[in-house]
């Protein structure tokens, strides 16, 4: 028996369902009574789901997994993972044993889009050219860790005096806070871009300083 999985990682959004595809080629006359199917975490061998002795043995992994029972006899051993969490990320091995056996691993990459950044300024009044200001760009609830880029109004990258921190919450999602310290010109626009490297999703925020009032 030869087991086949997708070579590319499966990308799944947090709280959505994901399908880890796995297939094998059943011989003529194959019956499910012959099938021994195991899904396990590759790095720990923790059992995720199994089908043995002609029946689905169910989920051994937080009761969020399911097979496609009607398709098993055709060689479809794919696994459905419901309500994906950050902690589900990793490699899963599909092991099929009939007379002989084979296995293959598929990677699950979890992702969550970042929110539109909010911009804050400190100080936020009585601003004059030559003042040092701190601009904070905050974006929330994304995964994996973001890449943050700052630019001025002419699109020139601002790399000096940038401090970025990323903190994971209890669900493993990241809140990003990036701080730019800059000396004000007569006027100017400062924009931050928060990029999710897996989703290739960009979230933009900007602040324009033209004397009073400020424009966000």
């Amino acid at each position: 028996v030869e087991v086949q999985v997708s070579e590319d990682p499966v990308v799944a959004l947090v709280d959505t369902d994901a399908t880890l595809r796995c297939s094998f080629s059943p011989e003529p006359g194959f019956s499910l009574a012959q099938l021994n199917l195991i899904w396990q975490l590759t790095d720990t061998k923790q059992l995720v789901h199994s089908f043995t002795e002609g029946r689905d043995q169910g989920s051994a992994y937080s009761n969020r997994t399911a097979l496609f029972p009607d398709l098993l006899v055709q060689g479809n051993a794919s696994l459905r993972l419901q309500r994906v969490r950050v902690t589900d990320e990793g490699s899963y091995t599909c092991f099929v044993s009939i007379q002989d056996f084979d296995s293959a691993a598929v990677s699950l990459q979890v992702a969550a889009p970042y929110s539109k950044p909010s911009m804050t300024l400190e100080p936020n009044k009585d601003l004059r050219p030559g003042n040092m200001v701190t601009i904070t760009c905050s974006s929330y609830q994304g995964y994996p860790e973001a890449e943050v880029f700052w630019k001025d109004g002419q699109g020139v990258p601002l790399t000096g005096n940038v401090t970025t921190s990323q903190m994971a919450n209890e669900r493993g999602l990241f809140d990003v806070h990036s701080v730019l310290r800059v000396v004000l010109g007569a006027n100017g626009t400062y924009s931050c871009l928060v990029r999710n490297p897996v989703l290739q999703q960009d979230a933009h925020g900007s602040v324009t300083i033209t004397g009073q009032p400020l424009t966000f």
């Epitope: 396990q40 790095d43 061998k45 199994s50 091995t93 092991f95 007379q99 002989d100 296995s103």
Partner: antibody, heavy 118, light 109 residues
Framework: EVQLLESGGGLVQPGGSLRLSCAAS????????MSWVRQAPGKGLEWVAG????????YYADSVKGRFTISRDNSKNTLYLQMNSLRAEDTAVYYC???????????WGQGTTVTVSS | QSVLTQPPSASGTPGQRVTISCSGS????????VNWYQQLPGTAPKLLIS??QRPSGVPDRFSGSKSGTSASLAITGLQSEDEADYYC???????????FGGGTKLTVL
Amino acid sequence: EVQLLESGGGLVQPGGSLRLSCAASGFTFSSYWMSWVRQAPGKGLEWVAGINRNGGTTYYADSVKGRFTISRDNSKNTLYLQMNSLRAEDTAVYYCARWNDYDIMDVWGQGTTVTVSS
Amino acid sequence: QSVLTQPPSASGTPGQRVTISCSGSSSNIGRRTVNWYQQLPGTAPKLLISNSQRPSGVPDRFSGSKSGTSASLAITGLQSEDEADYYCASWDDSLNTWVFGGGTKLTVL
């Protein structure tokens, strides 16, 4: 040729320590889980410990938990077993074994003898 | 006491067929590969059979089968050089340990 070669066995007093090594050759060491299995004189085989490819996951038999540590150095193609607080009942031949993706220990070393005695 | 149960001894005359059984549970043999090892006196164990698959170099006189939570090793055309200890083993995904049978000493009469 696929080969595993254990070393480091010897005579040690109860309560003492010993470190066993297993040098792998002829295959991509970092692609396999690895195990230690032992056999006391005149007894059967007993699995001791196992480790995954990158060393991030380790499992132990209850009889050695907290006393033995399995580790690996993929750059040196070497598996280790650090044995502390040794007891007379740890006296055995210790084998290292390659553990493949199908849950088969398919290649074994020739073994190294550990004797715990005062 | 071993997690996998196999008879302590078996015997047969040259040319005969002998079988050795191995009984486990759903968390090991029931869903995991069952392996058979031959250990000749004074040597390291050697892989003989995995489920019903023989590694290259193992004579086809040796065969394995698995049904539910039990497995068996059959040797046909018994030869004097088959005299050895035979062990069954499987990964147990509830215990997260490898489990072995106590071993069966095969005597060729």
